[in-house]
Interface confidence: low
């Protein structure tokens, strides 16, 4: 059976939206009005992985692009990147672990923990217009809480 997916946008807990700042980089900033059209639409696929009531494994692709968020080691540090894939083969139910995030729901907020690097989370900076990254701390300066907005297909 084809993998189940939904289209959505994400905003961090400060209401910053995610937009492209390069072909392989996302940034977070406040958008208003018409500029909201610039935000990235994700295709969130529900994939194979360790699942529990509050923890659901997902892959985050960019809608209509053959790009997926993935977690890799760079200079010995877990790093978030946008990785190009063959659109004929993705999305799939059994995604490679670097593409998998544990979507964790806490108090109506979402966290996205890397399956490859436990306790590392998709994060944004407090500052405006900065890259989205993989952070190893929760509850500190950096933001790890998101809300999800559904987008019709």
């Amino acid at each position: 059976a084809p993998v189940r997916s939904l289209n959505c946008t994400l905003r961090d807990s400060q209401q910053k939206s995610l937009v492209m700042s390069g072909p392989y980089e996302l940034k977070a900033l406040h958008l208003q009005g018409q500029d909201m059209e610039q935000q990235v639409v994700f295709s969130m696929s529900f994939v194979q992985g360790e699942e529990s009531n509050d923890k659901i494994p997902v892959a985050l692709g960019l809608k209509e692009k053959n790009l997926y968020l993935s977690c890799v080691l760079k200079d010995d540090k877990p790093t978030l990147q946008l990785e190009s894939v063959d659109p004929k083969n993705y999305p799939k139910k059994k995604m490679e672990k670097r593409f998998v995030f544990n979507k964790i729901e806490i108090n109506n907020k979402l966290e996205f923990e890397s399956a490859q690097f436990p306790n590392w989370y998709i994060s944004t900076s407090q500052a405006e217009n900065m890259p989205v990254f993989l952070g190893g701390t929760k509850g500190g300066q950096d933001i790890t809480d998101f809300t999800m907005q559904f987008v019709s297909s």
Epitope: V19, M20, S21, G22, P23, Y24, E25, K27, D35, E37, Q38, E64, K65, K74, E128, N129, M130, P131
Partner: antibody
């Protein structure tokens, strides 16, 4: 006001090297991707290279891969293009431009002429 | 490589005319399409980003539209200072590519 000031062009022999610089003022330089674009005499615009805000990601057009290196020094608010193994068809005016991909390239430097000739 | 094709390559128009330039991408690029104006001996200047967003300080007679593969730059009531070359540019994927340019000349 936001300004990009370029330096480093000139005449060089084929196979030679040049380093272009682009100094920024009036903006939070470290927040933005930066680009190099060139324009051969009488021709259109051609994107050469881009670098992400923190310098983690670098992109090049195929014809300069392995010969040109883009870099940045956010502390100095400067962008660089190291050009090695220069060829006659690299002759062009080279522009630096600030540019995230959702907002286009603006502003642009004044341009610097690179002439590769024997 | 994603190709951006502009048409026409040149056009002659009079002050006050409405001018339309089109840009076609070889594949869907959503709204990642920008328009620039360049005058001889000068650096390009951004007019429109994100297909239809007017860059700050650009006169409102310039407008952009389109999404996917087909885009349009319109100049309503052409002014003397608008005679220049116009370029579209896709920022959907690398290599970033420009159209070949449209030269707007005085009739």
């Amino acid at each position: 006001q936001v300004q990009l000031v370029q330096s480093g062009g000139g005449l060089v022999r084929p196979g030679g090297s040049l380093r272009l610089s682009c100094a920024a003022s009036g903006l939070i330089f470290s927040n933005y991707s930066m680009n190099w674009v060139r324009q051969a005499p009488g021709k259109g615009l051609e994107w050469v290279s881009s670098i992400s805000s923190a310098g983690s990601y670098k992109y090049y057009t195929d014809s300069v891969k392995g010969r040109f290196t883009i870099s940045r020094d956010n502390a100095k608010k400067s962008l660089y293009l190291q050009m090695n193994s220069l060829r006659v068809d690299d002759t062009a005016v080279y522009y630096c431009a600030r540019g995230d991909y959702d907002t286009g390239m603006e502003p642009w430097g004044q341009g610097t002429m690179v002439t590769v000739s024997s | 490589e994603l190709v951006s094709t502009q048409s026409p390559s040149s056009l002659s128009a009079s002050v006050g005319d409405r001018v339309t330039i089109t840009c076609r991408a070889s594949q869907s690029i959503s709204r990642y399409l920008n328009w620039y104006q360049q005058k001889p001996g000068k650096a390009p200047k951004l007019l429109i980003y994100g297909a239809s967003r007017l860059e700050s300080g650009v006169p409102s007679r310039f407008s952009g539209s389109g999404s996917g593969t087909d885009f349009t730059l319109t100049i309503n009531s052409l002014q003397p200072e608008d005679f220049a070359t116009y370029y579209c540019q896709q920022s959907y994927s690398t290599p970033l590519t420009f159209g070949q340019g449209t030269r707007v000349e005085i009739k």
